[in-house]
């Protein structure tokens, strides 16, 4: 894939930020060993990767979370990759789910999704999850990223 | 990516391997149905992927352990993959964690990580785990690569 | 990898899909959000994404669950990726792990596999789980695909 | 720019210890990750130990582990090695260096360096 300028390659790995917002999605940044492989594609208001050329892009995301079954919701926590393309209605791509632990204070889990989907241009991804506040954002714990096939 | 002989396709997959060692370094092998594309990537000490040529990677580890909440430490089970360069600091690039199972005699979980990363010439990735004694090296459970991009 | 026609990008991504057959091979089907580049990869069978062309891939597969330690066997879940190739024996690529969950009336847990392997001609690979009525089929959940590098 | 000033280097006898300190000033808020290399008469410069600002994540070079332990007290901006069962091998010239935040897989972002300290194992 080391592509000429009609073809450069394509790539981002971001890395999690703790955030004060109430959002259910995940925040981002390029700090770190992080990746931007050119402006084809951007972190944009830290939130979500937008690209700017159609194609065959493998997303992944992988988020570590500690939760204790006494403390959250009956429901497991849930990390969703999305999809927003202009024009188009918000999409899930890959969601996983795993049931909060027993061990106290809490217990760590980590999720990872990834698949290849077609991405149209100024399409952006970004990651959703049930309780932001049980995100780990300890070093590589939890990051957002994508390469175009 | 079928590239010429300027540019050939490179990418590794490598297969846990037992070991007597302490050391908390996961040790593979190129053993069963594993991948080395060519001599751009080695299995040096069968500990680390060395790679030749800079570039942008994708680089993968999966680690299936089987661990018990009472005769483990308080702390989980870590799973981290980490980068040597020439001259630079190790980094880690990403981490997992899992709480130990409570289940007897101990119970199982899988760990997968994976990312996008820019390695230099020489830039060699490695396993480190919190109890290696805990890993499960049963077929196809515990794995390493990467492709370069 | 935006490639010639001599060279065409090969590349699938396909969701789960219920069945009410007892065997442990999971279904797959090209709904929803799915990734079909060509025919050079297809799904046969709606069981396994088969490959026309010799070369090296990567491959995984994301299966979600839901089970219970009191009603589930002795056993994990286990979720094994395996390869079918022309006049060979079958054989496991890659294998996770989850040991059951306590809570009621089932946990959720995710698992994620990647790999990277040599196919052959005519190669196909499935998804083997150990109890598909466990398997948890929402929308994102559970997912199999390719890319050729 | 982050400054870094290191102190604890010596003389010491084999099996003896040693802790080194970094003091940082400037721009601390840059710091991503602070780190220790050593440098030998006639050899390149060695990796040793890193901590990562963020959350104390460590990693050590091999030759290193189970006797060195770096740590970080963050209110003072000072980073600690701490070396134990020292070797005649670990004479060197110790050299502490700092990471900045924003810097990338992409870019091979330079470090800021401490003058070095020298640490001379010998009976």
């Known amino acids: 894939m080391q592509k000429g300028d009609q073809n450069p390659q394509i790539a981002a790995h971001v890395i999690s930020e703790a955030s004060s917002k109430t959002t259910s999605v995940l925040q981002w940044a390029e700090k770190g060993y992080y990746t931007m492989s050119n402006n084809l594609v951007t972190l944009e208001n830290g939130k979500q990767l937008t690209v700017k050329r159609q194609g065959l892009y493998y997303i992944y995301a992988q988020v570590t979370f500690c939760s204790n079954r006494e403390a959250s919701s009956q429901a497991p926590f849930i990390a969703s990759l999305c999809l927003k393309s202009p024009g188009r209605f918000e999409r899930i791509l890959l969601r996983a789910a795993n049931t909060h632990s027993s061990a106290k204070p809490c217990g760590q889990q980590s999720i990872h999704l990834g698949g290849v989907f077609e991405l149209q241009p100024g399409a952006s991804v970004f990651v959703n999850v049930t309780d932001p506040s049980q995100v780990s954002h300890g070093t590589g714990f939890t990051s957002f990223g994508l390469l175009k096939l | 990516m079928q590239k010429g002989d300027q540019n050939p396709q490179i990418a590794a997959h490598v297969i846990s391997e037992a070991s007597s060692k302490t050391t908390s370094v996961l040790q593979w092998a190129e053993k069963g149905y594993y991948t080395m594309s060519n001599n751009l990537v080695t299995l040096e000490n069968g500990k680390q992927l060395t790679v030749k040529r800079q570039g942008l990677y994708y680089i993968y580890a999966q680690v299936t352990f089987c661990s018990n909440r009472e005769a483990s430490s308080q702390a989980p089970f870590i799973a981290s993959l980490c980068l040597k360069s020439p001259g630079r600091f190790e980094r880690i690039l990403l981490r997992a964690a899992n709480t130990h199972s409570s289940a007897k005699p101990c119970g199982q979980q899988s760990i997968h990580l994976g990312g996008v990363f820019e390695l230099q010439p020489g830039a060699s990735v490695f396993v480190n785990v919190t109890d290696p004694s805990q890993v499960s090296h049963g077929t196809g459970f515990t794995s390493f690569g990467l492709l370069k991009l | 990898m935006q490639k010639g026609d001599q060279n065409p990008q090969i590349a699938a991504h396909v969701i789960s899909e219920a069945s009410s057959k007892t065997t442990s091979v999971l279904q797959w089907a090209e709904k929803g959000y799915y990734t079909m580049s060509n025919n050079l990869v297809t799904l046969e069978n709606g069981k396994q994404l088969t490959v026309k062309r010799q070369g090296l891939y990567y491959i995984y597969a994301q299966v979600t669950f839901c089970s219970n330690r009191e009603a589930s066997s002795q056993a994990p879940f286990i979720a094994s990726l395996c390869l079918k190739s022309p006049g060979r024996f079958e054989r496991i690529l890659l294998r996770a792990a989850n040991t059951h969950s306590s809570a009621k009336p089932c946990g959720q847990q995710s698992i994620h596999l990647g790999g990277v392997f040599e196919l052959q001609p005519g190669a196909s690979v499935f998804v083997n789980v150990t109890d598909p009525s466990q398997v948890s089929h929402g929308t994102g959940f559970t997912s199999f695909g390719l890319l050729k590098l | 720019e982050v400054q870094l000033v290191e102190s604890g280097g010596g003389l010491v006898q084999p099996g003896g210890s040693l802790r080194l300190s970094c003091a940082a000033s400037?721009?601390?808020?840059?710091?991503?990750?602070m780190g220790w290399f050593r440098q030998a008469p006639g050899k390149e410069r060695e990796f040793i130990a890193v901590?990562?600002?963020?959350?104390?994540?460590?990693l050590y070079a091999d030759s290193v582990k189970g006797r060195f332990t770096i740590s970080a007290d963050n209110s003072k901006n000072t980073a600690y090695l701490q070396m134990n069962s020292l070797k005649p091998e670990d004479t060197a010239v110790y050299y502490c260096?700092?990471?900045?935040?924003?810097?990338?897989?992409?870019?091979?972002?330079?470090?800021?360096w401490g003058q070095g300290t020298l640490v001379t194992v010998s009976s």
């Open positions: 901590i990562y600002w963020r959350d104390g994540s460590s």
């Open positions: 260096a700092a990471e900045p935040y924003g810097s990338g897989s992409s870019l091979m972002s330079e470090y800021d």
């Open positions: 400037g721009s601390i808020s840059s710091i991503h990750a």
